[in-house]
């Protein structure tokens, strides 16, 4: 056929996989009669008749291409649709008339890949090895044509190296005629690889220009021997008693090896192993001054038996230890004098404080308090406290409590309680002195004592209202070996208009309990009630 | 220095009376309870009864109400047992001792040794 | 009124040995954080010597070796290292109440 030795290159179609190829034939008015065109698909140089036009009228053949084949443009341009990878071939139209002329056109078939998987060498690496290990391969699956990989570590790309990197790929036609493509990357690794990061990158064009997508980063288990061992206490800084602390052995080889934790034994000098939990912590809690010591670690290479030793570290657990005032129980005569001194040992220096137990006022800044002219009103607890000003919340504290000889002083002299005829009243009355007072009672009734504090003590007394009792009052008396004292509780019938808003009728009117500094208590109504005082 | 001396001791025959003393030296007497507690030959101690010199209140251990009587002389610093109707089982070392208002003693004398037999 | 019962009521040791001595109170001897209970030493022939008061608190001039600790009904005296000059009957005694009462006393012998 004459012209057929210099053949112009076909026209190139680029197209996505699944979507629709435009194949316009390209033949001339000169060259053919575009109402009268035979389409053809040449795959190892040998052409099939896919479809023929005739008037303008297209028909497809019968075969692969029969569904997917239809003419646009007016008979110009013959559309292939889904599009896949077996359709990349040479396909060509040729006119009838005047004479026979053909026009080809090459269709370019592409196909994205997946996202590249990259799965890591889960055995991970020993940087002694020979030759180049596995270290982790890449999949980038359904791509058309191959993609191209390359590797990376720490963001530089890598190169074929002897005996150092070597990158083996493979791919596989899957049934569809998409490419999956598997590369392997090998290398000698060595211990600052521990760290590396990796990953592949896949380069593939598009009708649109060339892409690429890249995996995730991966590390690289790498396996090295261990150099040196070491520990660490957490938290850093002062340790105080009462505080969670952690002793942990660590080492700079991987896989580490098998710790244990010793304490020095202060008496013998020898290294006596400690009880850690199951990640091989020393966990100290609550921390004890005894805790304090020379520790160190000791790892051992299971596979080498190589033992190596820690450098050993002090701990120090720092505390303060039981306060200690003296006298312990103090005892003195109105008018007298009084020291109270605080001892305490600690790891560090102490601060000493004196406060008042009741009011927390601070007396003094020191461990000695001295107390002149002792008043009954000087009684109570007074409490030091011998803290670490370095370490804040390291404190002991000690109370002590004062006890002034004196008869009983009563929490009020005499006091209003209004009651109804016939009703259970539940009369207190509370009474403080060194010794402790005992409180008796002028009326029958039931009465319970309760010790309030080495000094001071309450009476409470179940009495019923009659007209006698209402005549006479109650008295309560105080006494110890030093005196007594009384208290009167007059005894009022209410009626409607002494009643005050918030009273109850009912509960209101059974309970009146008689206690120093409260002179209104919530379930009784009382009037004009005096200060507490004492009968002394 | 704080001390507290028993006295008048001895052998007495069943029935009769005898009357301690215990001075008291380096202390406020007054300011002080003092007590007597006993111990017969291998046994154990047993309290007997208390004073309070500043106002003479006395305390005694149900077992000798009416049988004994604590006393003091503060003019002297002295305290007394004055005991009546001794029995055999009374036979005991007698000690005074010195306490404050939580009632634990604090300063003892030495004894003095009371044998009840005829 | 209120029984003390001390145990052991005799016991052998060795010179600094640990020592531990109870009291049991038939009821409690503690009152709003003091517990009312003493321990006294008595040697052949000499007075009983106030060791400890108030539970816990060390008498003036009594080595620090002896200790005590306790609350409500039961108490210990500990020895925490003896000494030859210890070997001694001990007695604990309350003060809660009227009448005042020891415990029998522990003979502490050497073993």
């Known amino acids: 056929v004459p012209g057929e030795a210099e053949q112009p290159a076909p026209e190139l179609v680029e197209v996505e996989v699944g979507s629709t190829a435009l194949l316009k034939c390209g033949l001339s008015q000169s060259q053919g009669n575009l109402s009268h065109v035979d389409w053809f698909s040449v795959h190892k140089e040998k052409r099939t008749l896919i479809f023929r036009v005739r008037q303008g009228q297209g028909q497809s053949e019968p075969g692969e291409y029969e569904q997917r084949l239809s003419l646009q443009d007016r008979g110009a341009t013959l559309a292939l649709t889904q599009v896949t990878p077996q359709d990349e071939r040479i396909f060509l139209c040729q006119g009838k008339r005047p004479r026979s002329q053909e026009y080809r056109i090459q269709l370019r078939v592409y196909k994205a890949p997946e996202e590249p998987n990259i799965q890591v060498n889960p055995l991970g690496i020993p940087v002694n090895s020979k030759e180049p290990e596995e270290v982790a391969t890449c999949v980038g699956r359904n791509g058309y044509p191959i993609p191209q990989v390359i590797w990376y570590k720490n963001g530089r790309p890598l190169k074929e190296e002897k005996n150092r990197v070597h990158i083996q790929s493979s791919q596989t036609v899957e049934s569809s005629g998409l490419y999956t493509l598997q590369s392997i990357l090998k290398a000698q690794l060595v211990k600052e690889d521990k760290d590396a990061q990796f990953y592949c990158e896949l380069n593939y064009r598009l009708p649109s220009g060339n892409h690429m997508k890249e995996s995730r980063e991966v590390t690289v288990p790498v396996f090295y021997p261990t150099e040196k061992v070491w520990l660490e206490v957490e938290p850093v800084g002062m340790l105080k008693e009462g505080d969670r602390v952690e002793i942990r052995c660590l080492a700079d080889g991987n896989p580490p090896p098998h710790f244990s934790i010793s304490k020095q034994n202060p008496s013998t000098r020898e290294a006596e192993e400690e009880t850690t939990n199951d990640n091989g912590v020393l966990v100290l809690e609550p921390a004890r001054k005894e805790h304090s010591g020379r520790y160190e670690c000791q790892g051992l290479d299971l596979d080498t038996m190589i033992s190596l030793l820690s450098e050993p570290q002090e701990l120090l657990v720092n505390y303060v230890s039981d306060v200690r005032v003296s006298p312990a129980a103090p005892e003195r005569q109105e008018g007298s004098s009084l020291t109270l001194t605080c001892e305490a040992e600690s790891s560090q220096d102490l601060e000493f404080q004196w406060l008042r137990e009741e009011t927390g006022q601070v007396l003094e800044r020191g461990p000695v308090l001295q107390l002149h002219d002792l008043k009954r009103e000087a009684g109570g607890g007074y409490r030091c406290v011998a803290s670490v000003p370095s370490i804040p919340g390291l404190n002991r504290t000690q109370l002590v409590n004062v006890a002034i000889f004196g008869p009983p002083w009563m929490a009020f002299k005499e006091r209003k309680v209004w009651v109804k005829e016939n009703m259970v009243l539940n009369l207190s009355c509370e009474a403080s002195g060194h010794p402790r007072p005992t409180i008796s009672w002028n009326v029958n009734g039931t009465a319970s004592e309760q010790d309030q504090d080495p000094q001071r003590v309450l009476s409470t007394l179940n009495v019923l209202v009659t007209p006698e009792l209402l005549e006479t009052g109650v008295e309560c008396t105080a006494s110890n070996d030093l005196g007594k004292n009384t208290s009167i509780l007059f005894l009022e019938l209410v009626n409607l208009t002494t009643l005050t808003p918030d009273s109850n009728t009912t509960t209101g009117l059974s309970t009146s309990t008689a206690s120093p500094h409260t002179r209104a208590n919530s379930t009784s109504t009382e009037r004009k009630l005096p200060e507490p005082e004492s009968r002394g | 220095q704080v001390q507290l001396v028993e006295s008048g001791g001895g052998v007495v025959q069943p029935g009769r009376s005898l009357r301690l003393s215990c001075a008291a030296s380096?202390?406020?007497?007054?300011?002080?309870?003092i007590h007597w507690v006993r111990q017969a030959p291998g046994k154990g101690l047993e309290w007997v009864a208390r004073i309070y010199p500043g106002t003479d209140i006395t305390y005694y251990n149900e077992k000798f109400k009416g049988r004994f009587t604590i006393s003091r002389d503060n003019s002297k610093n002295t305290l007394y047992l004055q005991m009546n109707s001794l029995r055999a089982e009374d036979t005991a070392v007698y000690y005074c001792?010195?306490?404050?208002?939580?009632?634990?003693?604090?300063?003892w004398g030495a004894g003095t040794m009371v044998t009840v037999s005829s | 009124e209120l029984v003390m019962t001390q145990s052991p009521s005799s016991l052998s040791a060795s010179v600094g040995d640990r020592v531990t001595i109870t009291c049991r109170a038939s009821?409690?001897?503690?009152?709003?954080?003091?517990?009312?209970m003493h321990w006294y030493q008595q040697k052949p022939g000499k007075a009983p010597k106030l060791l400890i008061y108030l539970a816990s608190n060390l008498e003036s001039g009594v080595p620090a070796r002896f200790s005590g600790s306790g609350s409500g009904t039961d108490f210990t005296l500990t020895i925490s290292s003896l000494q030859p000059e210890d070997f001694a009957t001990y007695y604990c005694q309350h003060s809660r109440e009227l009448p005042y009462t020891f415990g029998q006393g522990t003979k502490l012998e050497i073993k």
């Open positions: 009821k409690s001897v503690s009152i709003s954080g003091y517990s009312y």
């Open positions: 001792a010195r306490s404050g208002g939580y009632w634990y003693f604090d300063v």
């Open positions: 380096g202390f406020t007497f007054s300011n002080y309870w």
